[in-house]
């Protein structure tokens, strides 16, 4: 049971940062004009990804896309790269831990390839969020950078007569929702990394040893002994009784060639 | 068509209050920002207060920072002037505009109302 | 507070001619993040409410003649009128839309000789 709770979890965690890296990754707020200690102007500026945008005092709000490749910052290229492998890995990551889930039954799937498959979706889901953790950060410092940039020659003109006063860009609300959502989809992504140690069937010692009891012949089938993996190990190879019910998530003994003799 | 229209304008003493309305037809009222602007006898235009659309951003001149208050009333489409400590310097015709979407700039204006602080 | 210098501060022209009036505002009107100039011109004739001319220092508004064109950028801004009409007779100002308090210039006083 813990096992299927901390896979659908880390699966639910996982889906939601990655809707929040879609998110950040499409809004226009990733750098705002800083208003603290500025004149107070009629006109809001703010920079997204993909657009920069004005809001004037009128409500009237203008975008305007960049349109250009080669004349945009190399950072602002390395952080839309970084946002869209993070959101392809992630969206490859969910696809994958679908099938993954233990709630759902496709064919004969066996729990190795689950297993598997919930290890590849929470390594990819960890990759994704780091991709985006690391953009988010990287346009953070270009902003920490330019910020201190701008104060610095805050006021330039000619002759001290004629005052240019530069934007100043603050930190954005998409920043925040980027770190936050790529530490959603890390976290998820290392919780369906610990899902995989319990779905793993553990290997089993397939030695077939017939015990010859003085009265009946009774053979033992190895089936039913646990194996040492290392999770739950049973060290004493006690007989393990399939009387009781078991929950979902006890290592299932499936049928193998040496149960029927 | 747009119209904007004043009214509460008169002689008032100096040191006093008055109230000036400015009402707002032909367009959506509460989508608009609105502005205050006066001219003195023989001088020029000057900007008086702004409010936003929602009353929730205000600005003033400074010369009536303190003494003026801007407020709008969205469901009856009126705009309000609240004019005190009154001296003769505030003596002038005061325009209600409304701020353009696009630009900041006013593009309606009313027929003004005039305001004389005397004696 | 933003300063908005007006030049001449009179104006006295015949019809036809050709008429340019400046404006000169203590800082920049150009807002880097859509470069454009926060600068308007108004038309106000005697006994009437100022009327919007031109926004953005040089886009017309609708229904104004296009002898009037607005130019300039940052800190100095032109209004233009191609060949003055008997019904330009006016006080023309410039105001400041990009900082708050919207300050006006003191007007150029048209008049048609």
């Known amino acids: 049971m813990a096992v299927t709770a901390c896979q659908g979890l880390g699966f639910v965690v996982s889906l939601i940062g990655i809707a929040g890296i879609i998110a950040a990754t499409c809004m226009d707020q990733w750098s705002t004009q800083d208003l603290y200690n500025n004149p107070v102007t009629a006109v809001f500026n703010y920079q997204g990804l993909w657009r920069s945008c004005v809001r004037e005092s009128s409500g009237f709000t203008e975008c305007r896309g960049y349109f250009t490749l080669l004349g945009l910052p190399a950072m602002l290229q390395a952080v839309r790269a970084l946002m869209i492998v993070g959101i392809v890995l992630g969206a490859i990551g969910l696809l994958v831990s679908i099938f993954a889930l233990k709630c759902i039954r496709i064919g004969s799937m066996e729990d190795s390839a689950k297993a598997n498959m919930t290890l590849t979706s929470g390594i990819m889901f960890i990759v994704s969020g780091l991709c985006a953790i690391a953009g988010v950060s990287v346009f953070a410092n270009m902003l920490v950078t330019n910020f201190w940039m701008s104060t610095a020659n805050m006021y330039t003109g000619m002759g001290g007569m004629v005052q240019t006063v530069q934007t100043r860009y603050t930190f954005g609300a998409a920043l925040f929702v980027g770190w936050v959502a790529g530490g959603l989809t890390l976290i998820g992504g290392v919780m369906m990394c610990i899902a995989c140690r319990g779905l793993a069937p553990e290997e089993t010692n397939y030695k077939a040893v017939s015990y010859h009891a003085s009265g009946h012949s009774v053979a033992y089938k190895p089936g039913g002994f646990k194996a040492s993996t290392g999770f739950g190990s049973n060290t004493k190879n006690k007989k393990i009784y399939d009387g009781g019910a078991r929950t979902e998530d006890e290592v299932q003994s499936y049928p193998s060639k040496h149960d029927y003799v | 068509d747009v119209q904007l229209v004043e009214s509460g304008g008169g002689l008032v003493q100096p040191g006093g209050s008055r109230k000036l309305s400015c009402g707002a037809s032909?367009?959506?009222?509460?989508?608009?920002?609105m502005h205050w602007v006066r001219q003195a006898p023989e001088k020029g235009l000057e900007w008086v207060a702004y409010?936003?659309?929602?009353?929730?951003?205000?600005h003033y001149a400074d010369i009536v920072k303190g003494r003026f208050t801007v407020s709008r009333d969205n469901p009856r489409n009126t705009l309000f002037l609240q004019m005190t400590s009154l001296g003769s310097e505030d003596t002038a015709i005061y325009y209600c505009?409304?701020?353009?979407?696009?630009?900041?700039?006013?593009?309606?204006w009313g027929q003004g109302t005039s305001v004389t602080v005397s004696s | 507070d933003i300063v908005m210098t007006q030049s001449p501060s009179f104006l006295t022209v015949t019809a036809g001619e050709k008429v340019t009036m400046s404006c000169r505002s203590s800082q920049s009107l150009l807002n880097s993040g859509n470069q454009r100039n926060y600068l308007t011109w108004y038309q106000h004739k005697p006994g009437q409410s100022p009327k919007l001319l031109i926004y953005w220092a040089s886009t017309r508004e609708s229904g104004v003649p296009d002898r009037f064109t607005g130019s300039g950028s940052g800190t100095t801004f032109t209004l233009t009128i191609s060949s003055v009409q008997p019904e330009d007779l006016a006080v023309f100002y410039c105001?400041?839309?990009?900082?708050?308090?919207?300050?006006f210039g003191s007007g150029t006083k048209l008049e048609i000789r």
């Open positions: 409010i936003s659309s929602d009353s929730s951003t205000k």
């Open positions: 505009a409304r701020l353009r979407r696009g630009g900041n700039a006013l593009d309606y």
């Open positions: 105001q400041n839309n990009y900082y708050f308090p919207f300050t």
């Open positions: 032909g367009f959506t009222f509460s989508s608009f920002g």
